[in-house]
Interface confidence: low
């Protein structure tokens, strides 16, 4: 894996064990971008001390990429030409097409909390007047 493992705790196991899930996922929300352009999908897990062991990025039940605490990034072969890892645990989509419009999910596997999921809706516009959502920053 040619990318550095992000600086967070954890390993390759999923969370669980029946603990109270106190965390919340902050996302970029609804965003739009121009056809042919790029967009950063970003989520942030807060309000929990659980270890993040893996983050999956999915679109309509298809895995785009996974970032594993031990292994670093894995990009699904069918998306490797248009998906770039980062920044952080986010995902950059490139060479956008109108078909990229839809729901994207960040899925945080944590221990001991379990699984947290965040939703982002991306609209890819034909015109050059796409309004991007507010810039999202990881604290």
């Amino acid at each position: 894996y040619p990318y550095d493992v992000p600086d967070y705790a954890g390993g390759g196991g999923s969370g669980g064990g029946g603990s109270m899930m106190t965390g919340t996922i902050e996302t970029t929300g609804n965003i739009s971008a121009e056809k042919g352009g790029s967009i950063i999908l970003q989520c942030h897990l807060s309000s929990t001390t659980a270890q993040v062991t893996q983050v999956n990025w999915e679109q309509q039940d298809q895995l785009l990429a996974a970032c594993n605490a031990d292994l670093g990034w894995h990009i699904s072969p069918s998306f490797k030409d248009r998906v770039a890892p980062g920044p952080g645990l986010g995902l950059t989509l490139q060479s956008l097409t109108v078909n990229d419009t839809g729901e994207y999910f960040c899925i945080y596997h944590t221990y001991p909390d379990g699984t947290y999921t965040g939703r982002i809706f991306l609209e890819v516009l034909e015109s050059s007047v796409a309004e991007h959502g507010a810039r999202f920053q990881i604290p």
Epitope: G12, G17, D61, L63, D70, T115
Partner: antibody
Framework: EVQLVESGGGLVQPGGSLRLSCAAS????????MHWVRQAPGKGLEWVAF????????YYADTVKGRFTISRDNAKNSLYLQMNSLRAEDTAVYYC????????????WGQGTMVTVSS | DIQMTQSPSSLSASVGDRVTITCRAS??????LAWYQQKPGKAPKLLIY???TLQSGVPSRFSGSGSGTDFTLTISSLQPEDFATYYC?????????FGGGTKVEIK
């Protein structure tokens, strides 16, 4: 071709110890989390222990916690299960299994090694 | 821990039949369910993960559906090599837990 081969099983008395090994080949062992799963004779599957690829996360089933120790040697492409204070209810076929990278399912399994705890 | 309950525990079917096995989780596991096939004296084999994703090399007659607490494994047209025991497993959270198994026998 992915291959997982367990060894080290056998007959042991209650209270005794055994060390199981799992030799991996056909893939980059150091990239994958690994599980031990067992199956008592005529029964279903029971997850036993997990170790992440770099050994930074280790989890155990409550039934074996404090008695079993999972470890790995990535240089030797090997997974281990040290079993102490064995009980009759630990009698089972023990399988090592590889965890998928993208989801927490077990995509390749060894053929298993039989552990019998009996006096 | 999450309890996984499979039904039926056994069933008899003929070659060509459509077979459905269900698995229920004691609490929501989103879509994180795997299905395995095991033949006597052999290791389990992964068929489906993440609820509905077919593992590479598995015939398309196997399909999975469901989310939350209720899941189904369907074999659209049973073949002679499909007579085996099938297990579900939740891979949403630790400790990973399996259903009790469903034995598919020849009628």
């Amino acid at each position: 071709e992915v291959q997982l081969v367990e060894s080290g099983g056998g007959l042991v008395q209650p209270g005794g110890s055994l060390r199981l090994s799992c030799a991996a080949s056909g893939f980059t062992f150091s990239n994958f989390g690994m599980h031990w799963v067992r199956q008592a004779p005529g029964k279903g599957l029971e997850w036993v222990a997990f170790i992440s690829s770099g050994s930074s996360s280790i989890y155990y089933a409550d039934t074996v916690k404090g008695r079993f120790t999972i470890s790995r040697d990535n240089a030797k492409n090997s997974l281990y299960l040290q079993m102490n204070s064995l009980r009759a209810e630990d009698t089972a076929v023990y399988y090592c299994a590889r965890m998928r990278l993208d989801y927490y399912a077990m995509d390749y399994w060894g053929q298993g090694t039989m552990v019998t705890v009996s006096s | 821990d999450i309890q996984m309950t499979q039904s039926p525990s056994s069933l008899s079917a003929s070659v060509g039949d459509r077979v459905t096995i269900t698995c229920r989780a004691s609490k929501s596991i989103s879509k994180y369910l795997a299905w395995y096939q095991q033949k006597p004296g052999k290791a389990p084999k992964l068929l489906i993960y993440s609820g509905s994703t077919l593992q590479s090399g598995v015939p398309s007659r196997f399909s999975g559906s469901g989310s939350g607490t209720d899941f189904t494994l369907t074999i659209s047209s049973l073949q002679p090599e499909d007579f085996a025991t099938y297990y579900c497993q939740q891979h949403n959270e630790y400790p990973w837990t399996f259903g009790g198994g469903t034995k598919v026998e020849i009628k």
